[in-house]
């Protein structure tokens, strides 16, 4: 009898270890998406960036989906969201249309059920990029903790997309689940 | 018999609580390293910062190692990495040679197995710090979610290190493990 | 007998799943507080921001307390803290008192037991907001990993509070618990 109980206990321990480990992993979706430089739109006004890498270099995704330029939540939870956006201009790229620039990022959430879009985070700066300097650079970082529901979509909008730095270490955004919703 | 089973169950519960708690703690390495102001290098180009505090003030480390100016990963996993770098100049600080500054940070990952270094994140700005103002300040923040393997090393490079703000609340970097690798 | 053991095992599994889930949730306090625009103080020097929303829009709180303008820790642990602060000025708002601005944020920790206040993180920039441009904007982001004890309080100080952007996506701060203290 007591051997049988020990065997059962081992089973409990074993299955638990397995279950705990598995459930812990499955409970933690994440994504880190890096800019796809081959497909950056032009313009100076607010533009949605739809081309991101999720499967090369630093780009990765798990238990979330990337579709139509949006990061789709598959699992309810509280997530930490972040974005890093770099802008740059070199005089060899040609003259800027204006020296006064508004370099901005907006991290937005779209709900399909109630078709509406809301800005979760914004950041940036107005800049004076004068012709006295041959090179200009500026980076924005934003981050915050948000409740996301399955099916909601995260997207990135920027101003002056043609000035984006196309490096994977420069322009990226991401999310990781921190905890369940009570 | 039934008392014996209850006792076994209590043991299972107890050992499990202990195991779960212990494994949870052990599964979460972290570090928050603050600049060591007594040993900031000079230079204007990209310079590696090798002197950081891990055991005083806000500096702390657990289940990671700090050696030779690098933060060494001891445990495979997905980590959130961050850095905050502040630059400043006061007219009493010294004779600034140029108003046009490139104030940058690069968070790099080095693999010992395949001796190579890659930039995970970069940020910063070109700045015009004119003599019309007696004080100048600028801060950069970057953060992102990365897969790190045991033995890999994280280091920080900056431009214009002599302009760094030496306060522990100003210039620091860190990491914490969020989840295991599947 | 063996049925009884299976039943016990199911109970162990069930109670464990429940306990693990519950303890996991309870072990993860968080807060995301957004600026209350109706109560922004004036002045250009360092000012503590005491009015934040924790229960509307993106504002939320769990297992932490918001009181007297401070975020109070209820549970010992290591937390990731963050803040995003946006400043803006439009010429229609009137003339700025000075074109040379120091736009700063300080994230501070206060211990009630030992009445003392310490800056955990700072960020910002000196800016020249000239009259040549009708609109100016600048955002700061800071983040870091800190050990917090129950009863400790987190607060936000900024310079030039009258220039704060009052949008919930612009000016906010938050925290989430990542792990226990060993």
């Amino acid at each position: 009898g007591s051997q049988h109980i020990r065997a059962e206990k081992a089973m409990v321990d074993g299955s638990w270890l397995d279950l705990a480990k598995r459930s812990k992993l499955e409970a933690q979706p994440f994504a880190h998406l890096t800019i796809n430089a081959t497909d950056i739109p032009s313009g100076s006004h607010k533009v949605s960036l739809s081309s991101w890498y999720h499967d090369r270099g630093w780009g990765k995704i798990s238990n979330m989906t990337f579709s139509n330029g949006k990061l789709i939540v598959n699992q309810d939870g509280f997530y930490y969201l972040y974005a890093n956006i770099c802008f740059r201009h070199h005089e060899t790229s040609g003259d800027l249309a204006t020296e006064y620039l508004q370099l901005m990022v907006y991290v937005t959430k779209t709900s399909i059920k109630i078709p509406s879009s809301h800005t979760l985070m914004k950041g940036g700066s107005t800049k004076y990029w004068s012709g006295n300097s041959e090179f200009h650079f500026y980076s924005i970082n934003v981050g915050g903790f948000f409740k996301l529901r399955s099916g909601e979509e995260i997207s990135i909008e920027v101003s002056n997309p043609s000035l984006l730095d196309p490096d994977q270490d420069a322009t990226y955004f991401g999310a990781f689940k921190v905890r369940d919703i009570d | 018999g039934s008392q014996h089973i209850r006792a076994e169950k209590a043991m299972v519960d107890g050992s499990w609580l202990d195991l779960a708690k212990r494994s949870k703690l052990e599964a979460q390495p972290f570090a928050h390293l603050t600049i060591n102001a007594t040993d900031i290098p000079s230079g204007s180009h990209k310079v590696s910062l090798s002197s950081w505090y891990h055991d005083r003030g806000w500096g702390k480390i657990s289940n990671m190692t700090f050696s030779n100016g690098k933060l060494i990963v001891n445990q495979d996993g997905f980590y959130y990495l961050y850095a905050n770098i502040c630059f400043r100049h006061h007219e009493t600080s010294g004779d600034l040679a140029t108003e046009y500054l490139q104030l940058m940070v690069y968070v790099t990952k080095t693999s010992i197995k395949i001796p190579s270094s890659h930039t995970l994140m970069k940020g910063g700005s070109t700045k015009y710090w004119s003599g019309n103002s007696e004080f100048h300040f600028y801060s950069i923040n970057v953060g992102g979610f990365f897969k790190l393997r045991s033995g890999e090393e994280i280091s920080i490079e900056v431009s214009n290190p002599s302009l760094l703000d030496p306060d522990q609340d100003a210039t620091y970097f860190g990491a914490f493990k969020v989840r295991d690798i599947d | 007998g063996s049925q009884h053991i299976r039943a016990e095992k199911a109970m162990v599994d069930g109670s464990w799943l429940d306990l693990a889930k519950r303890s996991k949730l309870e072990a993860q306090p968080f807060a995301h507080l957004t600026i209350n625009a109706t109560d922004i103080p004036s002045g250009s020097h360092k000012v503590s921001l005491s009015s934040w929303y924790h229960d509307r829009g993106w504002g939320k709180i769990s297992n932490m307390t918001f009181s007297n303008g401070k975020l109070i820790v209820n549970q010992d642990g290591f937390y990731y803290l963050y803040a995003n602060i946006c400043f803006r000025h439009h010429e229609t708002s009137g003339d700025l008192a000075t074109e040379y601005l120091q736009l700063m944020v300080y994230v501070t920790k206060t211990s009630i037991k030992i009445p003392s206040s310490h800056t955990l993180m700072k960020g910002g920039s000196t800016k020249y907001w000239s009259g040549n441009s009708e609109f100016h904007f600048y955002s700061i982001n800071v983040g870091g990993f800190f050990k917090l004890r129950s009863g400790e309080e987190i607060s936000i100080e900024v310079s030039n509070p009258s220039l704060l952007d009052p949008d919930q996506d612009a000016t906010y701060f938050g925290a989430f618990k990542v792990r226990d203290i060993d």
Epitope: - | A97, T98, E99, P161, S162 | -
Partner: antibody, heavy 122, light 107 residues
């Protein structure tokens, strides 16, 4: 070819004024901080003023502060030194020197002109 | 101000000799020392900066070392064209100060 050519030296009475010029060529002048360094007859080198690349910061040792003024015109690739209240001890060859790139707080000089002679005597 | 004391003030050596000049700073200047060569009737030329870095195009026989307050400049094998006066300069803090110079003559 990178070149610095000084001019404007000469003989001047004590208490008098003189304006030195330095014409730069062969490099992007606006990117470099510049200095004036002098050398009294048979003596060593003495730094007398410096100016940042954009011209908004100017620096002097106590020996000349309030009497000398350094300036630049980046559009003309030119550096200037206005010297007032001249004294006999200001007699020297004055060199225009380019500060090498390096740490923003450290000044050493990688390109020097041939110098122009200033003599202060009654 | 940081005083720079150079020694010797002059020396005479043969072609092929190893020549060493020292420079002492009145306070710690880390490695912020430059060395210049000035030939008779000419303007100075930068040889070494940050104590040990040779400037572009400078022959490898010229080298520098030291940190803190004591610095050494070495010509490993003296050549006839090395006849000149050599100056050290601290580039650690303003005002930028030079040593008194060392005149190197060929025997």
């Amino acid at each position: 070819e990178v070149q610095l050519v000084e001019s404007g030296g000469g003989l001047v009475k004590p208490g008098g004024s003189l304006r030195l010029s330095c014409a730069a060529s062969g490099f992007t002048f606006r990117n470099y901080a510049m200095s004036w360094v002098r050398q009294a007859p048979g003596k060593g080198l003495e730094w007398v003023s410096g100016i940042s690349s954009g011209g908004t910061y100017t620096y002097y040792p106590d020996t000349v502060k309030g009497r000398f003024t350094i300036s630049r015109d980046n559009a003309k690739n030119s550096l200037y030194l206005q010297m007032n209240s001249l004294r006999a001890e200001d007699t020297a060859v004055y060199y225009c020197a380019r500060r090498d790139y390096g740490d923003v707080y450290e000044w050493y000089f990688d390109v020097w002109g041939k110098g122009t002679t200033v003599t202060v005597s009654s | 101000d940081i005083q720079m004391t150079q020694s010797p003030s002059s020396l005479s050596a043969s072609v092929g000799d190893r020549v060493t000049i020292t420079c002492k700073a009145s306070q710690d200047v880390r490695t912020s020392i430059a060395w210049y060569q000035q030939k008779p009737g000419k303007s100075p030329k930068l040889l070494i900066y940050s104590a040990s870095y040779r400037y572009t195009g400078v022959p490898s026989r010229f080298s520098g070392s030291g940190s803190g307050t004591d610095f050494t400049f070495t010509i490993s094998s003296l050549q006839p064209e090395d006849l000149a006066t050599y100056y050290c300069q601290q580039h650690y803090s303003s005002p930028w100060t030079f040593g008194g110079g060392t005149k190197v003559e060929i025997k």
